[in-house]
C-alpha cells in the first residue's frame, strides 16, 4: 500500500505589475500530476506582510491570486498543493510548501521619506493629499506622487501639485471615476542632488476619508410651549442623505451647552420657561452605513433665535 504524494506548485512567484502595492501571486501546476488526471487539484495559499502576526489563507483552483500589500514592508507567501480525499481514497494529501518573498529594495535613510501624509476626500468629490518634507532634506529635494486604483490601466502621476517655495508638498487630484469602495494606492517618492530619498506607500479607501461640507439652512420652530424643533438641510453635493450623521451643539442663554449626535436632519429640544435665547451649530460626517470612517465637516454658521419671538410666531 504505497503512500500517495504530491509535489508543490512550480514557479511560485510574487509579481509587481507597478500598481503601488497591488501584487500578483502566481504559480504553475505541480510536476507529475498524471496520476491524478481525474482530480481537481486545489492550492492552499498563505501570505502576509512581514511583521504581521497573521497569515491570510486562500484555497483556490486557479493558478494566480491578486491582493493589496503594504510595500513599505516585505511580503512573504507560501503555497502547497491539496489533493482532496476523493482522489486519494481517504484523507486529504498535502504537498510541502513552496515559498516566495518580495520587497522593494529601498534607497535613502528612513527620515528622508515624506512626513505627516494626510489625504482628504472633500465632499466625496475632490481628493487632496498633503505632506511635509522628510527630516533633514534640502530645498533641492522634490517629491512626486503616483496613484493607482482598480480601473486604471497604469499608475498615474499627480498633474496638479501644491507647491511651497518650489517644493511639492501636496497634490490636487483630478476627477476620480469609480474610485470608491476599493483600495486606492499611493506612492510618494523623491529626488535630490545631495542624497537618495526614501519612497513611502499608502493605501486607503476614499469613502473612509470623506470630509463633507457643513449642513446649511438651519431653522428653528417652536412645536409646543417647551419643545423647539431644530432643522437643517444636507449640504450640496453627491453624498446622499442616508449617508450622513450629524453632531449638534446647542447653547441656551450662553450657559448650558448640549452636544448630541443624530441620524437625520431634525432634532427636538426640550426647553424651560427660563430659556430666553437659543443658538446652535451642526456638522456632518459620513455614517457607518456608508463608510468605515470619516472626517467631521466644519461647523455650520451659528444661528440664534429669541425664544419669545419663536413663541409669537407659533401663536400667530
Amino acid at each position: 500500500d504505497t503512500e500517495i504524494k504530491v509535489n508543490p506548485p512550480q514557479d511560485f512567484e510574487i509579481v509587481d505589475p507597478g500598481y503601488l502595492g497591488y501584487l500578483y501571486l502566481q504559480w504553475q501546476p505541480p510536476l507529475s500530476l498524471d496520476n491524478f488526471k481525474e482530480c481537481t487539484v486545489e492550492y492552499e495559499l498563505k501570505y502576509r506582510n512581514i511583521g504581521s502576526e497573521t497569515w491570510t489563507t486562500i484555497i483556490t483552483k486557479n493558478l494566480h491570486y491578486k491582493d493589496g500589500f503594504d510595500l513599505n514592508k516585505g511580503i512573504e507567501a507560501k503555497i502547497h498543493t491539496l489533493l482532496p480525499w476523493q482522489c486519494t481514497n481517504g484523507s486529504e494529501v498535502q504537498s510541502s510548501w513552496a515559498e516566495a518573498t518580495y520587497w522593494i529594495s529601498p534607497q535613502g535613510i528612513p527620515e528622508t521619506k515624506v512626513q505627516d501624509m494626510d489625504c482628504v476626500y472633500y465632499n466625496w468629490q475632490y481628493l487632496l493629499c498633503s505632506w511635509k518634507p522628510g527630516i533633514g532634506v534640502l530645498l533641492d529635494t522634490n517629491y512626486n506622487l503616483f496613484y493607482w486604483y482598480e480601473g486604471l490601466d497604469r499608475a498615474l502621476q499627480c498633474v496638479d501639485y501644491i507647491k511651497v517655495d518650489g517644493q511639492n508638498i501636496g497634490c490636487r487630484f483630478p476627477y476620480l471615476e469609480s474610485s470608491d469602495y476599493k483600495d486606492f494606492y499611493i506612492c510618494v517618492n523623491g529626488s535630490s542632488e545631495t542624497k537618495p530619498i526614501r519612497s513611502s506607500y499608502f493605501t486607503f479607501q476614499l469613502q473612509n476619508i470623506v470630509k463633507p461640507l457643513p449642513p446649511v439652512c438651519l431653522t428653528c420652530t417652536q412645536e409646543s410651549l417647551y419643545e423647539i424643533k431644530l432643522k437643517w438641510s444636507i449640504p450640496l453635493g453627491p453624498i446622499p442623505a442616508r449617508c450622513f450623521v450629524y453632531e449638534i451643539e446647542i447653547r441656551e442663554d450662553d450657559t448650558t451647552l448640549v452636544t448630541t449626535t443624530v441620524e437625520n436632519e431634525t432634532y427636538t429640544l426640550k426647553i424651560t420657561n427660563e430659556t430666553r435665547q437659543l443658538c446652535f451649530v451642526v456638522r456632518s460626517k459620513v455614517n457607518i452605513y456608508c463608510s468605515d470612517d470619516g472626517i467631521w465637516s466644519e461647523w455650520s454658521d451659528k444661528q440664534c433665535w429669541e425664544v419669545e419671538e419663536l413663541l409669537k410666531k407659533t401663536l400667530l
Partner: antibody
Framework: QVQLKESGPGLVAPSQSLSINCTVS????????VHWIRQSPGKGLEWLGV???????DYNSALMSRLTISKDNNKSQVFLKMNSLQSDDSAMYYC??????????WGQGTSVTVSS | QVVLTQSPAIMSASPGERVTMTCTAS???????LHWYHQKPGSSPKLWIY???NLASGVPARFSGSGSGTSYSLTISSMEAEDAATYYC?????????FGSGTKLELK
C-alpha cells in the same frame, strides 16, 4: 549562504588614501544594499555610508568629503575609498548587508592602521 | 545627529540572574528602526534584536527588547555564560546612522 569579506591594505601612511573591497556571496547587490562601518577603541562603532541596491549612495556627513563608495554588481563587490587618512582613522573596517532597515550580516572586518 | 547613550557601560551578572540594560536616544527614534547588536571579542557584531523587540534568527528566547521614543531596553530573563558579550544599540532612523557606545556584560 550569505557572506561578506573585506580586504584592505592593513597599513596606510598618514595623508594617503585607503581602498577596501567587500566581496559578497549568497545574495545579489541588485537586491540588497551594503553598509560600511568602522570600529575603533576611541570612537566605537561609526557608520560611514551605504551603497543602495539601486546604485545611489548615502554618506555620513562628517566624513562625506573624504569618502567614495562604489560597486560592481557583476563582480559582487563594493568598494570604499577614503582620502587623507590620519591616525584616528585607524580602526577595524566592516561591510554589512542591509536588510529591511537593519544590518543583518557583517563581514569579519579588515584592520587598518594609519602610521608612517 | 542622534546620540545613543547606553547604561551601564559595564555590568556583571551571575548565571540565572535577570539582566536589563538601557539605551537612551537624544532625539525620538521610531521603534521600527531601533536595533541591538551582540559582539564577542575578536568577532564582528551580529544583529541580535531588530525593530525594538524582534529576536534575530537563532537568538535564544530569554532575550527580549522593549521601548519607544527615546528610551529602549534589552533584557535577559536568566543569564547564561554564553550571553557574556558587548551589546550595542543602533538607530537606523536618522542620518548619520549611529550606535551606542555599548554595554559590556560579564559573567560573575
Amino acid at each position: 549562504q550569505v557572506q561578506l569579506k573585506e580586504s584592505g591594505p592593513g597599513l596606510v601612511a598618514p595623508s594617503q588614501s585607503l581602498s577596501i573591497n567587500c566581496t559578497v556571496s549568497g545574495f545579489s547587490l541588485t537586491k540588497y544594499g551594503v553598509h560600511w562601518i568602522r570600529q575603533s577603541p576611541g570612537k566605537g562603532l561609526e557608520w560611514l555610508g551605504v551603497k543602495w541596491a539601486g546604485g545611489s549612495t548615502d554618506y555620513n556627513s562628517a566624513l562625506m568629503s573624504r569618502l567614495t563608495i562604489s560597486k560592481d554588481n557583476n563582480k559582487s563587490q563594493v568598494f570604499l575609498k577614503m582620502n587623507s587618512l590620519q591616525s584616528d582613522d585607524s580602526a577595524m573596517y566592516y561591510c554589512a548587508r542591509d536588510h529591511r532597515d537593519a544590518m543583518d550580516y557583517w563581514g569579519q572586518g579588515t584592520s587598518v592602521t594609519v602610521s608612517s | 545627529q542622534v546620540v545613543l547613550t547606553q547604561s551601564p557601560a559595564i555590568m556583571s551578572a551571575s548565571p540565572g540572574e535577570r539582566v536589563t540594560m538601557t539605551c537612551t536616544a537624544s532625539l525620538s527614534v521610531s521603534s521600527t528602526y531601533l536595533h541591538w547588536y551582540h559582539q564577542k571579542p575578536g568577532s564582528s557584531p551580529k544583529l541580535w534584536i531588530y525593530s525594538t523587540s524582534n529576536l534575530a534568527s537563532g537568538v535564544p528566547a530569554r532575550f527580549s527588547g522593549s521601548g519607544s521614543g527615546t528610551s529602549y531596553s534589552l533584557t535577559i530573563s536568566s543569564m547564561e555564560a554564553e550571553d557574556a558579550a558587548t551589546y550595542y544599540c543602533h538607530q537606523y532612523h536618522r542620518s548619520p546612522l549611529t550606535f551606542g557606545s555599548g554595554t559590556k556584560l560579564e559573567l560573575k
